[in-house]
Interface confidence: low
């Protein structure tokens, strides 16, 4: 197999890598590399990530921390978890809103925007599935309402004239 192999580090523990002249111990999560070690198997100089930056993993080479992401207010996102030295901001949607992915194959890192959940009650419909990671799913019309076009219309209360089948209990019509 071609190519050069990095020299093996014969140090106790496995958190050592060749940095410059020597095998050095890496920096823990939340710290960046200020300077490599000055002796074999020594400790690198590591500094804590400044405010609003983070590094999620232990590392041997990052000389600066990553900037924390800002949640996209234009997309109605909110911070579910604030950024720390070891973790990026976790953006999501506030209660009553759900995530609408902006790409077809959605993964956790995909861009998204927040949509308000459908209020089935305001549409006079049953709630079939509550809004969480997907929109509310509304069912058929609530008692006292019937399907008309795309909406639910209040049942007539008079026994005169026609009474839609779903309104039998309201306007007294029976089959």
């Amino acid at each position: 197999q071609g190519g050069t192999r990095s020299p093996r580090c014969d140090c106790a523990g496995d958190f050592h890598k060749k940095i410059g002249l020597f095998c050095c111990r890496g920096c823990p999560a939340g710290h960046y590399l200020k300077a490599p070690c000055t002796e074999p198997c020594g400790n690198s100089t590591c500094l804590v990530c400044p405010q609003d930056t983070f590094l999620a993993w232990e590392n041997h080479h990052n000389s600066e921390c990553a900037r924390c992401q800002a949640c996209d207010e234009q997309a109605s996102q909110v911070a579910l978890e604030n950024c720390s030295a070891v973790a990026d901001t976790r953006c999501g949607c506030k209660p009553g809103w759900f995530v609408e992915c902006q790409v077809s194959q959605c993964v956790s890192s995909s861009p998204f925007y927040c949509q308000p959940c459908l209020d089935c009650g305001a549409l006079h419909r049953h709630t079939r599935l509550l809004c969480s990671r997907r929109d509310t799913d509304c069912g058929t019309c609530l008692p006292g309402f019937y399907e008309h076009g795309d909406g639910c219309v209040s049942c007539p209360t008079s026994t005169l004239g026609s009474c839609p089948e779903r309104c039998a209990a309201v306007c007294g019509w029976r089959q």
Epitope: E100, C101, R128, G139, T140, E147, E165
Partner: antibody, heavy 121, light 115 residues
């Protein structure tokens, strides 16, 4: 007695179109959401498309989105599936299936006997 | 897309019993599924819906020999006193919404052979 009877299947060439129909009887058609589900020979069930009781909500599987169109005529107790730009992988038995009127749950409680679609050159 | 996993086959002796499993992907462990029976060259038939708490409701004409239960992400269909007409493929299915898109996903089916 609830009945769903599909028709319109047959042999078609790739790129051609077919329209499937499903005629319903024995229940109040306009109260129910409806679905098309297909089954390739010797394979499992694959959901194709959904339409709500008043056509206000329509959804498609990724494999057919942009090529198939689901519609219904509540006055005629009929459900339709317009299939355009057919591909060989659309070869399957196509079933229409009824979603029960409000149960608070998802189910497909009655199925038609199916209509066979074969796409081959 | 949600994932429902079923083993491909199971066998049961006449008058014996068999228990079929449908496993949901972990994030859906509280979702309701539906069991369907499909006899050879026939349309699927609704057997029951089955909630995460084990409560279930059977379709018209489904005998008492069929029952459902749940444990975590697993949904079970049990058939006791198995009869020859139970020889069929059993699918689990689940309706779901993702954003505004409604859909169904099905397991690959378990073929039950009555010996």
């Amino acid at each position: 007695e609830v009945q769903l009877v599909e028709s319109g299947g047959g042999l078609s060439q790739p790129g051609n179109s077919l329209q499937l129909s499903c005629e319903a009887s024995g229940f109040t058609f306009s109260n129910h959401d409806l679905n098309w589900v297909r089954q390739a020979p010797g394979k499992g069930l694959e959901w194709v498309a959904y339409i709500s009781s008043a056509s206000g909500l329509i959804s498609y599987a990724d494999a057919v989105r942009g090529r198939f169109t689901i519609s219904r005529d509540n006055a005629k107790n009929s459900l339709f599936l317009q299939m355009n730009n057919l591909k060989s992988e659309d070869t399957a038995m196509y079933y229409c299936a009824r979603d029960p009127a409000y149960t608070g749950l998802y189910a497909l409680d009655f199925w038609g006997q199916g209509t066979q679609v074969t796409v081959s050159s | 897309q949600p994932v429902l996993t079923q083993s491909p086959s199971a066998s049961a002796s006449l008058s014996g019993s068999v228990k079929l499993t449908c496993t949901l992907s972990s994030e859906l462990s509280n979702f309701t599924i539906v069991w369907y029976q499909q006899r050879p060259d026939k349309a699927p038939k609704y057997v029951m819906y089955l909630k995460s708490d084990g409560s279930h409701s059977k379709g018209d004409g489904i005998p008492d020999r069929f029952s459902g239960s749940s444990s975590g992400a697993h949904r079970y269909l049990s058939i006791s006193n198995v009869q020859s007409e139970d020889d069929a493929t059993y699918f689990c299915g689940m309706g779901y919404t993702l954003a505004n898109q409604y859909g169904w996903v099905f397991g690959s089916g378990t073929k039950v052979t009555v010996l």
